[in-house]
């Protein structure tokens, strides 16, 4: 006969490990008992359990409540056991020794490998501002056994660097993602991807990039000067800019206070029916925590009466 087992049994921390040991006998051979022991090099054998064909399962005190037989139906030639709630200290060599009748004793060894899946963490770097050079966007750290793999998934252009620290039973891996901040990166996802044999699927942590910037300001509304004439209703100026964080807007008049009746509504300056006193230089002031910008325009309200010499009146009579 011969013993059938696995070279390596791999289990995730906290899960149960099945330690296989099956005796494939010759005609009529019976299994009397199966003894399981921990047999790490340099240390004496430590008994786990004894499976007796007549008296059942006896578990040694050190493993009380942690070693079980598989549920029935059980092949009488199957000496496999279940080690409950595997911990890192369980990692090592195990031996199954099968006593058969009449063939005698057989033994086989297997290695138990306990995987410790990582719990990754992502730490954003310092605030990103347009105009900075190469800057740390985020770092991602994961510790496990064996060492996890840490990579980045993003459309953003950047560079990565990794380092690893070995501990007694695990390894910590840290990867950093550096970039040159630009406004086009705003709102873009930067995802840390952690792979490990103890994970059913990769773990992903996503950080949304925020790059502080403030665009140049410009004022819209004066494209057709002829529309800015006395009496016109609904005239308005709109200040155009964009930024992160979103900017605030402030309107002033360079050559005096804002005329009465002029309404400030955020980025928009609304005028009452135009008069010549609305002529002047208007300044839009845009600011956020990152920067500030100004844009000024000259409003010249036309008086149609001054152009009366150019008018031709048509009189029709019948």
């Amino acid at each position: 006969g011969e013993l059938e087992t696995s070279d390596v049994v791999t289990v995730v921390l906290g899960q149960d490990a099945k330690l296989p040991c099956f005796y494939r006998g010759d005609s009529g051979e019976q299994v009397g008992q199966v003894a399981w022991a921990r047999v790490d090099a340099g240390e004496g054998a430590q008994e786990l359990a004894l499976l007796h064909s007549k008296y059942g399962l006896h578990v040694s005190p050190a493993y009380e409540g942690r070693v079980e037989q598989p549920p029935p139906p059980r092949n009488p030639l199957d000496g496999s056991v279940l080690l409950r709630n595997a911990v890192q200290a369980d990692e090592g060599e195990y031996e199954c020794r099968v006593s058969t009748f009449p063939a005698g004793s057989f033994q086989a060894r297997l290695r138990l490998r306990v995987l410790v899946p990582p719990l990754p963490s992502l730490n954003p770097g310092p605030a990103l501002e347009e105009g900075q050079g190469l800057t740390l966007a985020a770092s991602c750290t994961a510790e496990g056994s064996p060492a996890p793999s840490v990579t980045w998934d993003t459309e953003v252009k950047g560079t990565t660097s990794s380092r690893s620290f070995k501990h007694s039973r695990s390894a910590a891996v840290t990867s950093e993602f550096h970039l040159v901040p630009s406004r086009s990166m705003n709102g873009q996802p930067l995802t840390c991807v952690v792979s490990h044999p103890g994970l059913l699927q990769d773990q992903r942590i996503t950080h949304i990039l925020h790059v502080s910037f403030l665009a140049e300001a410009s004022v819209r509304g004066l494209e057709d000067q002829n529309l800015w004439h006395i009496g016109r209703e609904g005239a308005m100026l709109k200040c155009l800019s964009e930024g992160q964080p979103p900017p605030s807007y402030n309107w002033t008049r360079l050559d005096g206070p804002l005329p009465s009746g002029v309404r400030v509504d955020g980025d928009t300056l609304g005028f009452p029916p135009l008069t010549t006193e609305h002529s002047g230089i208007y300044v839009c002031h845009v600011s956020n925590e990152f920067s500030s910008r100004d844009s000024q325009v000259t409003v010249d309200v036309l008086d149609p009466q001054e152009d009366s010499g150019k008018q031709v009146d048509l009189v029709s009579a019948s």
Epitope: F22, D26, S27, Q30, P70, P71, P72, N75, P76
Partner: antibody, heavy 116, light 93 residues
């Protein structure tokens, strides 16, 4: 080569018993166990029981009261007997050789109809 | 279609410690063992078949489907009372 050949009736009266013999060749019943499985359109494949190489048996709890599996090692035969058959026991019954946690060779199947 | 790759999955309600087998059955025939102990190919089974998985999730992959691969596939666990899956019928497109 490994073979399992089944013999048994195709028609059984309600409340009567079913007996099937599985004759094996190419391996010894002292080395391998034999499982019994049935297949019906309504319930799919169902494991019924097993006789191990040493002669001990295990049964599906749903059939334990009316199922018996035995063997004659010298004749390389395994015997399956199920009592008190009803219409919903109509199925194809298979014997199959045990591999560690699998069934690696199957008989040709015995189609059983329970009807009066 | 012939030449394609297909993956059939089988999920157990609790950990079955890789005590899982895959079978193929063609109309009017007995089931045939393909994979045992979740990942081990049975004798005579073409290498385009492969089994994987652990814990509660298992799968059977067939690379480059051949015409003879069409039929019904069953998974079966051997942890406690053996139970079969309901079967997956693989048909030619």
């Amino acid at each position: 080569q490994v073979q399992l050949k089944q013999s048994g009736p195709g028609l059984v009266q309600p409340s009567q018993s079913l007996s099937i013999t599985c004759t094996v060749s190419g391996f010894s019943l002292t080395n391998y166990g034999v499982h019994w499985v049935r297949q019906s359109p309504g319930k799919g494949l169902e494991w019924l029981g097993v006789i191990w190489s040493g002669g001990s048996t295990d049964y599906n709890a749903a059939f334990i009261s009316r199922l018996s599996i035995s063997k004659d090692t010298s004749k390389s035969q395994v015997f399956f007997k199920m009592n008190s058959l009803q219409a919903d026991d109509t199925a194809i019954y298979y014997c199959a050789r045990e591999l560690i946690h699998a069934m690696d060779n199957w008989g040709q199947g015995t189609s059983v109809t329970v009807s009066s | 279609s012939v030449g394609e790759t297909v993956t059939i999955t089988c999920r157990a309600s609790e950990n079955i410690y890789s005590n899982l087998a895959w079978y193929q059955q063609k109309q009017g025939n007995s089931p045939q063992l393909l994979v045992f102990a979740a990942t081990n190919l049975a004798d005579g089974v073409p290498s385009r078949f492969s089994g994987s998985g652990s814990g509660t999730q298992y799968s059977l992959k067939i690379n480059s489907l051949q015409s003879e691969d069409f039929g019904t596939y069953y998974c079966q666990h051997f942890w406690g009372t053996p139970t079969f899956g309901g079967g997956t019928k693989l048909e030619i497109k």
